[in-house]
C-alpha cells in the first residue's frame, strides 16, 4: 500500500507544484516570487536537459488550470517553449510547428518517468 501511495502522491505533488508555481508572475509576496522563480528555472532546465514536457506529458498544460495557462493563451502556447524539440543551439527546431502541436516538433514524454527512475533507486 505504501508503494502505491508513493506512486500516487509523488507525481501529484510534482504536478501541483509545477501547475501552481511555474511561470507564476503574480505571487502574494516576495518569498513566493522567489520560490516561483526557483521552480520555473528548475523545470526549464529539466525539460531542456531531459527532452521531456511537464510531469506526465504535454497534456498537463492543457488538462489542468495553471499559472502558465493564466499567463499564456492556449492558442499562443499550448505548452512551454522548453517542451519544443531544440536544435544544437538550444533554439526550437521549428517553433511554429511546436506551437501548433505537430508531432516530432515537441516532446511527448513526461519528465516524471525520467526522474522517477533515479529517485526510486534511492
Amino acid at each position: 500500500t505504501a508503494a502505491t501511495q508513493q506512486d500516487f502522491f509523488t507525481p501529484n505533488l510534482f504536478l501541483k507544484q509545477m501547475l501552481e508555481r511555474y511561470q507564476n508572475n503574480s505571487p502574494p509576496n516576495n518569498d513566493d516570487q522567489w520560490k516561483n522563480n526557483g521552480v520555473t528555472k528548475t523545470w526549464d532546465r529539466l525539460m531542456l536537459q531531459d527532452n521531456c514536457c511537464g510531469v506526465n506529458g504535454p497534456s498537463d498544460w492543457q488538462k489542468y488550470t495553471s499559472a502558465f495557462r493564466t499567463e499564456n493563451n492556449d492558442a499562443d502556447y499550448p505548452w512551454p517553449r522548453q517542451c519544443c524539440v531544440m536544435n544544437n543551439l538550444k533554439e526550437p527546431l521549428n517553433l511554429e510547428a511546436c506551437k501548433l502541436g505537430v508531432p516530432g516538433f515537441y516532446h511527448n514524454q513526461g519528465c516524471y518517468e525520467l526522474i522517477s527512475g533515479p529517485m526510486n533507486r534511492h
Epitope: N73, A75, D76, Y77, N87, E91, P92, L93, N94, L95, E96, A97, K99, L100, V102, P103, G104, F105, N108
Partner: antibody, heavy 121, light 113 residues
Amino acid sequence: QVQLQQPGAELVRPGSSVKLSCKASGYTFNSYWMHWVKQRPIKGLEWIGNIDPSDGETYYNQAFKDKATLTVDKSSSTAYMQLSRLTSEDSAVYYCARRGTAQATTWLGYWGQGTLVTVSA
Amino acid sequence: DIVMTQSPSSLTVTAGEKVTMSCKSSQSLLNSGNQKNYLTWYQQKPGQPPKLLIYWASTRESGVPDRFTGSGSGTDFTLTISSVQAEDLAVYYCQNDYSYPFTFGSGTKLEIK
C-alpha cells in the same frame, strides 16, 4: 480568397530604413504565421524569419537578426518588415508568404507579389 | 544551418522529354514524429513569386499537373517532370521546411529548346 498585398516598389537611400507592408485578406489573420523571404538574382531565395500574429512572437534567421524587424497590426490584418541601415546588399525583392493550411506548418502556399527595394543614392 | 544543394544549375530540354533534377540536404529532413520528409518544391516563372508544387517531398499540391512527381527521403530528393511542356519554363527551388532557418536550394533553371 486568400490575398497578400504588397506595394510594388520602394526606392530608398543608403543608411536609411524602410518599412515594408503586407496586407492580408480572405482568411483569419491571427491563425497563420507570416513568413518573409528575400530574393536577389545571384543569391536566390533567403528565408528572413516569421511572426505569429496572435502574440507577435518572432523567429529570425540569424543572418537577418540585426537587419530585419517583423511586426503585425492585427486591427488592419497587416504584417510589416522594417529593414534598417540599408546598403546595396539589401536591394532585392521581398516577399511575404503564408502556410497553405492551418494544421500543417510546412510549405508556403500563398505569396504576395513582392516589393522591389532599390537602395540608391 | 541546413544547406540545400541543387543540381544541375540549369538544363535545356525539348518539349515532351522527361526531366529529373536533384536536391540534397546536409541533414535529414525526415521528421520521426510523423514520418514525413519536410522538403518542399517550388516553381518560379519570370516576374512571378514562387508557386508551391510539392510538399512533404512527394505530395502534389492541388491543381499541379500529374506530370510533376517528387520522390526521395532523408537527405536525397528528386523532382521529375515526365513530359516537359513549354509552360514549364521556370526555375525550380527545393526548400528545407524542417528546421529553422528554413533554407532554399540555389535553384535549377529549366529552359525549353
